[in-house]
Interface confidence: low
């Protein structure tokens, strides 16, 4: 049976969904086990021009000291203003001084990146030492790549389409993930979903996504249910700032209680079956329905409360 | 809501000075990153200049045709943005609108008028 | 630097017809935007990142496009839309405009 709810964008005011995700277009992670420098490259496309970006860097620690050194290959198509954290590391930083302007001097070896075209700039990487890793990422807010962490079978690091860089690189893109919302027809009341749809990753190792939900309103306004929706292999981590009611695939905890796994259900894995379930637990109002490439974690903040739905 | 009202223009002579200003209000002004943009009349807009945020340690960018003739400044405490014109040519005449960039130009000011003829 | 060349020029066209509007970029680029700007008034955004309306734009409005094909149409012309609507990109230094489409009453 066909659900009727005409899913239209939501105002951001009234619902909006940022993620972490360790997706990329391109990408690849390598292994460099005997490497004396530790090499990374980055292709930032950055749509819009001018941007800001957030990007950290983090070591596991070997025997208490770093591994070895880092060279950071930063290749950057527009204007970016650049928050570098990466305390402690030995990091050499090749970029192009035209594009890259730093919040507070970097601290770090610089070296000027030679204009290149994406094939040569890998080649000229791989020069310096074998790659760790290589990511192609469109408008990133923030990135934090793992230092030490590659866990790539990959001898030799080839950029491929759609890739997991798992724990090495994730990133947190600019823009908001598309919130959607409608009206279930014929369902009385005020009571409303939220529903979020993660899509199947690149690699199918276990995950747990943690989904922070916050609803702006009075905890008495609200009656909701929370359709969480992904891959056999995801599980979930909800960290909600109020009581509603839970509807997964997979198993469930709250961030209060983590070690209590709750099992969760088989869902349709479709945007109409999920609006299907929706309605069939008593929803009036689909406050928000998102769906999103595989995710380390998702925040959701909403003000529906039950009241009247705004689509933008 | 965000206002942007562009004052200072007026007639000057071919080698001349004027400087714009821009008053804002309506949002966090020290946080945006603010544009000239100007228009000959009955002609397309061009860019001309941009100033960024304090974030951004108020970094500046000019078109090739005006770099090193006109200058971009801010005053965050004022909320006002300026834009000094020096040796000033006929070919500067236009409408120059200050704009607020944030992924694209969202806020426009109504322009003020800039003649340069003798 | 990307050029941006809009056509047509001029689009005369009446109430409730269709008006396709193209901006081709001499280079690909990753996004445009669109403002719309009327005689006496400043510009106004109308469409940001190839695809979304500003806001306040009615659904009429729509744009698409990609690399260095770029189009804004508007499904059925309402009296208020015959104005100048001009492009823009900042994929690539400078920012650059289109010489703009005016979209007039036939």
């Known amino acids: 049976e066909t659900v009727h709810c005409d899913l239209q964008p939501v105002g951001p005011e009234r619902g909006e969904v940022t993620y972490t995700t360790s997706q990329v277009s391109k990408g690849c992670v390598a292994q460099a086990p005997n490497a004396i420098l530790e090499v990374h490259v980055l292709f930032l496309e950055f749509p819009t021009g001018p941007s800001q970006l957030e990007l950290t860097l983090q070591a596991s620690k070997q025997n208490g000291t770093w591994p070895r050194e880092v060279l950071l290959v930063l290749s950057v198509n527009s204007s970016v203003f650049l928050h570098l954290q990466a305390l402690g590391i030995p990091l050499h930083l090749a970029y192009n001084s035209s594009l890259v302007t730093f919040q507070e001097p970097p601290g770090v070896n610089t070296t000027e990146l030679p204009s290149f075209p994406k094939t040569q700039i890998l080649e000229w990487a791989a020069e310096r030492g074998p790659i760790t890793s290589a990511a192609e990422l469109n408008d990133p807010q923030s990135i934090l790549l793992r230092l030490g962490q590659a866990q790539g079978s990959l001898s030799f690091c080839m950029l491929e389409a759609s890739q997991d860089m798992g724990r090495t690189l994730e990133w947190r893109p600019r823009t908001p993930a598309l919130v959607r919302g409608c009206h279930l027809e014929g369902v009385a009341g005020h009571k409303e979903a939220h529903i979020l749809r993660v899509l199947p990753g690149h690699s199918a190792g276990p995950r747990t996504v943690t989904v922070k939900v916050e609803l702006s309103c009075a905890p008495g306004d609200l009656d909701a249910v929370l359709i969480l929706q992904g891959p056999p292999y995801v599980s979930w981590l909800i960290d909600a700032n109020h009581n509603m009611q839970i509807w997964t695939t997979g198993e469930y905890s709250f961030k209060i209680f983590p070690e209590k796994n709750i099992r969760g259900f088989k869902l349709p894995d479709t945007p109409q079956g999920l609006l299907g379930e929706a309605r069939m637990l008593n929803a009036s109002i689909v406050a928000s329905f998102v769906e999103l490439p595989l995710a380390s974690i998702v925040s959701l903040h909403a003000s529906s409360c039950g009241g009247r739905l705004q689509t933008s | 809501e965000v206002q942007l009202v562009e004052s200072g223009g007026g007639l000057v002579q071919p080698g001349g000075s004027l400087k714009l200003s821009c008053a804002a209000s309506?949002?966090?002004?020290?946080?945006?990153?603010m544009d000239w943009v100007r228009q000959a009349s009955g002609k397309g807009l061009e860019w001309v200049a941009e100033?960024?945020?304090?974030?951004?340690?108020?970094?500046?960018y000019y078109a090739e045709s005006v770099k090193g003739r006109f200058t971009i400044s801010r005053d965050d405490s004022k909320n006002t943005v300026y834009l000094q014109m020096n040796s000033l040519k006929t070919e500067d005449t236009a409408v120059y609108y200050c704009?607020?960039?944030?992924?694209?130009?969202?806020?426009w000011g109504q322009g003020t008028l800039v003649t340069v003829s003798s | 630097e990307i050029v941006l060349t809009q056509s047509p020029a001029t689009l005369s066209l009446s109430p409730g017809e269709r008006a396709t509007l193209s901006c081709r970029a001499s280079?690909?680029?990753?996004?445009m935007h669109w403002y719309q700007q009327k005689p006496g008034q400043a510009p106004r955004p109308w469409i940001y990142?190839?695809?979304n309306l500003a806001s306040g734009i009615p659904a009429r409005f729509s744009g698409s496009g990609s690399g260095t094909d770029y189009t804004l149409t508007i499904s059925s012309l309402e009296p208020e839309d015959f104005a100048v609507y001009y492009c823009?990109?900042?994929?690539?230094?400078?920012?650059?405009f289109g010489g703009g489409t005016k979209v007039e009453i036939k």
């Open positions: 704009t607020r960039w944030r992924r694209f130009f969202d806020s």
């Open positions: 309506g949002f966090t002004f020290s946080d945006a990153w």
């Open positions: 100033i960024r945020s304090k974030a951004s340690n108020h970094a500046t």
């Open positions: 280079s690909s680029v990753s996004y």
């Open positions: 990142a190839t695809s």
């Open positions: 823009q990109q900042w994929s690539s230094n400078p920012l650059t």
